[in-house]
């Protein structure tokens, strides 16, 4: 019996009946054994077939076998009801070997030419299976030359049998207070050869409740308890199960905060598995009763471990723990069934006693001493000498606990001194220097510090003066002795003020003319305004209309009088404004350098002389009456003039204050 080629030789070739293409002889028996490599099969087909036809091919035949299985017994030329001829059929071995047997009996009625066949080894596609047969692989089958391999979907691992996919279903930990878990692929059939472990792990104090839902189908056995597939539930105190079959297990109240669920499957079966909905419970906390004027959120039927509530107060009420305020309040239920914080109160907002208003007073409108939410108070300034700035003085206790003005301001109103008040009424005519009476020049300030000078009170903590008068003290402001509220230069009865800082105009150059001869002194304390101490007003934009040529201004001071001594009593003089060109011309001739009079200066005095300010008056105010507001304002600052005060054809020169309003305002607002 000839053997066909064996692997690793190339496996292909031709087979033919003895004597082919001539007729075959009687009593012949020929056997071929073909062997292909592992993972390969043999394919065989006939190009010629002509054998004696007999019932069930008993006489002459070709038999194809693979292992113990006969693939075909062939005879004749064409197939009949009971006999088979190969025709165009292709035959395949079942494994890697194929046996071909040819036999002829003792006689032939006529000559038959036999057969010719060709064979070859080809790869087996193990991944293709006949309908109804079990698939080669659980999930994915991959064919290759000489073999195949299986692989698994994500979440699965190939079992050591190399075909089954076991679920990767262990190590899942559920920490939420409720949830769902199920067998892998539920409600589709669960995987074979798997061992699943699920953990529910809640905070201490919780108790897990398990409910089996929808359907339950785990392989079972009529006599033995769950021998194939089973579900077990384990807590720190007891074990439940094993469970299998088709009946939904009852609810399990574990009384434990940790649960382990184990699900084991074998290699066979087709069952849909299980689904568990778990919840948890804990010892409830006492129901929170909202404090008066407050409410609880969220509202729940009960509050258990980890549940929380917040308290919100009605508008105008605030959270308080005793005397201590809280912005928010949230309490959390603890495992022992108590809240972690005590309930606060919602107390009516109390803005407290309003702050005192400097130079003003406060009146309770709602009721004596009432300072709670929506209470109203009224601030007012001391009449005559103070006026309220910007504000109407009405404040309401708002929900944030602050007294708030109608404009939404939380700061106190400001009582600003009324400026430009004087006891003096002016006559239109010019007359000689006179003694001032009380209240005539309440802005007048006496400045002592090396020399005698003057200034004018602005607001209640600034003094306007000439730069040359305080230049020497610019770095030692505290050396300035500032007195106000008195008429007599040497009187012990005056209001003392001290300087905090001196601001000299940056454009002023000492001993090089008097341009920009202006300075501000900041007092270290506010002075109390009264009939003898009142600030002078700064000029309005429209003030120039009251300072035209020949308009009368008033200068006051303790400077040199005609007798050549400093005045004991405050003196004043009413003098007209002089045309600027006329004044400029008066100071163009020697000994005065050209350009002595600048646009930042104004001149006042009589052509005939005799009325003037003099040394010791420096820094004092030249004031004018604003007939619209009926307030006095500072138009000039006593700056310089001829060596001989009151000289005919010469005039007093004053710093023109209206040119310096931005400078004054900037310094006062910045400091």
């Amino acid at each position: 019996t000839p053997l066909g080629p064996k692997w690793p030789e190339p496996v292909f070739g031709r087979l033919a009946s003895p004597g082919f293409p001539g007729e075959y002889a009687n009593d012949q028996e020929r056997r071929w054994t073909l062997t292909a490599p592992p993972g390969y099969r043999l394919r065989l087909y006939f190009t010629h077939f002509d054998l004696e036809l007999s019932h069930l091919c008993e006489y002459d035949f070709v038999k194809l076998s693979s292992g113990a299985k006969v693939l075909a017994t062939l005879c004749g030329q064409e197939s009949t009801d009971t006999e088979r001829a190969p025709g165009k059929d292709t035959f395949y071995s079942l494994g890697s070997s194929l046996d071909i047997t040819f036999r002829s009996d003792y006689s032939n009625e006529k000559p038959f030419t036999g057969f010719e066949a060709f064979y070859a080894a080809e790869d087996i596609d193990e991944c293709q299976v006949a309908p109804g047969e079990a698939p080669t692989c659980d999930h994915h089958c991959h064919n290759h030359l000489g073999g195949f391999y299986c692989s698994c979907r994500a979440g699965y691992v190939l079992h050591r049998n190399k075909r089954t996919c076991s679920a990767l279903c262990s190590g899942q930990v559920f920490t939420q207070r409720s949830g769902e878990l199920s067998s892998p692929e539920y409600p589709r059939p669960y995987p074979k050869l798997s061992s699943c472990t699920y953990s529910i792990s809640l905070e201490e104090g919780f108790s897990v409740i398990l409910d089996f839902v929808e359907s339950f189908d785990v392989e079972t056995h009529p006599e033995t308890l769950c021998p194939y597939d089973f579900l077990k539930i384990q807590t720190d105190r007891e074990e439940h199960g094993p469970f299998c079959g088709k009946t939904l297990p009852h609810r399990i109240e574990t009384k434990s905060n940790t649960v382990t669920i184990t699900f084991v499957t074998d290699e066979s079966g087709d069952h849909t598995g299980w689904k568990i909905h778990y919840t948890s419970t804990a010892q409830p906390c006492p129901y929170p009763m909202a404090p008066p004027n407050g409410h609880v959120s969220p509202v729940q039927a009960k509050y258990i471990l980890k549940d929380s509530f917040s308290i919100f107060c009605e508008t105008g009420y605030e959270l308080l723990q005793g005397h201590l305020p809280l912005k928010s309040f949230t309490a959390v239920c603890q495992k022992d069934g108590s809240w972690d914080r005590p309930m606060p109160a919602c107390s009516i907002v109390d803005c407290g006693p309003p702050d005192d208003l400097p130079s003003g007073r406060v009146e309770y409108i709602t009721g004596p001493g009432v300072t709670t939410y929506k209470a109203v108070i009224q601030y007012s300034c001391e009449e005559t000498f103070y006026t309220m700035k910007v504000n109407d003085g009405k404040y309401v206790c708002e929900a944030d606990g602050f007294w708030t003005s109608s404009k939404g301001e939380k700061s106190l109103p400001v009582c600003e001194p009324v400026c430009g008040l004087s006891a003096r009424t002016t006559g239109g005519r010019i007359y000689g220097g006179q003694k001032a009476k009380p209240g005539d020049f309440p802005w007048q300030v006496l400045i002592l510090g090396g020399t005698t000078a003057a200034g004018a009170l602005l607001y209640d903590n600034w003094v306007l003066t000439a730069a040359h008068a305080v230049y020497e003290q610019k770095h030692d402001a505290s050396a300035l002795d500032i007195r106000m509220g008195t008429l007599k230069r040497l009187s012990p009865h005056y209001t003392q003020a001290w300087s905090e800082a001196v601001f000299i105009h940056e454009g002023y150059t000492h001993d090089a003319g008097f341009d920009n001869d202006i300075a501000l002194i900041k007092l270290n304390n506010k002075v109390v305004i009264n009939s003898n101490i009142t600030p002078i007003c700064l000029p309005r934009k429209e003030a120039e209309s009251f300072m035209r040529t020949d308009d009368i201004g008033t200068a006051s001071g303790w400077g040199l009088t005609q007798r050549g001594f400093l005045a004991r009593n405050l003196m004043y003089v009413d003098i007209p404004i002089v045309d600027h060109q006329k004044c400029t011309a008066a100071y163009e001739k020697p000994p005065y350098p050209r350009g002595s009079v600048t646009a930042n200066m104004l001149c006042a005095g009589l052509e005939s002389g005799g009325k003037d300010s003099c040394r010791g008056d420096s820094g004092g105010a030249l004031v004018f009456l604003d007939s619209e507001t009926e307030r006095w304002f500072v138009g000039g600052i006593v700056s310089w003039g001829s060596m001989n005060c009151g000289e005919a054809g010469q005039y007093g020169v004053y710093t023109k204050v209206i040119n310096y309003i931005p400078w004054i305002e900037n310094i006062i607002s910045d400091f």
Epitope: Q321, G322, H323, L324, P325, K327, P342
Partner: antibody, heavy 114, light 107 residues
């Protein structure tokens, strides 16, 4: 971790103003709570001076009301104490604390002496 | 002002024993009372708030009780680190006030 730290001069002259600052880290002073100043004279009990709340409102011990000011700088997460016209009786360890004392500063000794 | 009176001024206890500290308020303060522990040279350490609520991190041997005007701090089993001065504090009304302290010393 919430931390409070007092800072300021350890020596103040009589009649002058005592100034201390409490710097808070780990929690915003505008988020919630009252922020207190408390002092403890040597060998004596604790004395609450006043607080400034998360909203900026203040509450003072009436015995100090005319001399005390508590303010805050929210940009620096600090609150401050000013106590004017001090005398030797104001010598103490000064603490800042939160609300009803869950967190305290380490304290700073202020001596009033000429 | 609400006066907080602590008694006794000094308490001598052996380690492992129970210590009971009392604090009386001169008027009703609800449960708005806190307890502090203070050791020499250190700032106070908060133990209890709202009369009976223990701060996190405070050992369970410390417990507080009471309401209205009478309050108690109990240390169930004194440890060596518990020997210190203990203050009660009311925050119910302005001005907030403190007790004079109870010194717990080793017997």
């Amino acid at each position: 971790q919430v931390q409070l730290q007092e800072s300021g001069p350890g020596l103040v002259k009589p009649s002058e103003t005592l100034s201390l600052t409490c710097t808070v880290s780990g929690y915003s002073i505008t988020s919630d709570y009252a922020w207190n100043w408390i002092r403890q004279p040597p060998g004596k009990k604790l004395e609450w001076m006043g607080y400034i709340s998360y909203s900026g409102r203040t509450s003072y011990n009436p015995s100090l009301k005319s001399r005390i000011t508590i303010s805050r700088d929210t940009s620096k997460n600090q609150f401050s104490l000013k106590l004017s016209s001090v005398t030797a009786a104001d010598t103490a360890v000064y603490y800042c604390s939160r609300h009803y004392g869950d967190y305290w500063g380490q304290g700073t000794l202020v001596t009033v002496s000429s | 002002d609400i006066v907080m009176t602590q008694s006794p001024a000094t308490l001598s206890v052996s380690p492992g024993e129970r210590a009971t500290l009392s604090c009386k308020a001169s008027q009703n303060v609800g449960t708005n009372v806190a307890w502090y522990q203070q050791k020499p040279g250190q700032s106070p350490r908060a133990l209890i708030y709202s009369a009976s609520y223990r701060y996190s991190g405070i050992p369970a041997r410390f417990s507080g009780s009471g309401s209205g005007t009478e309050f108690t701090l109990t240390i169930s089993s004194l440890q060596s680190e518990d020997f210190a001065v203990y203050f009660c504090h009311q925050y119910n009304a302005n001005p907030l006030t403190f007790g004079g302290g109870t010194k717990v010393e080793i017997k």
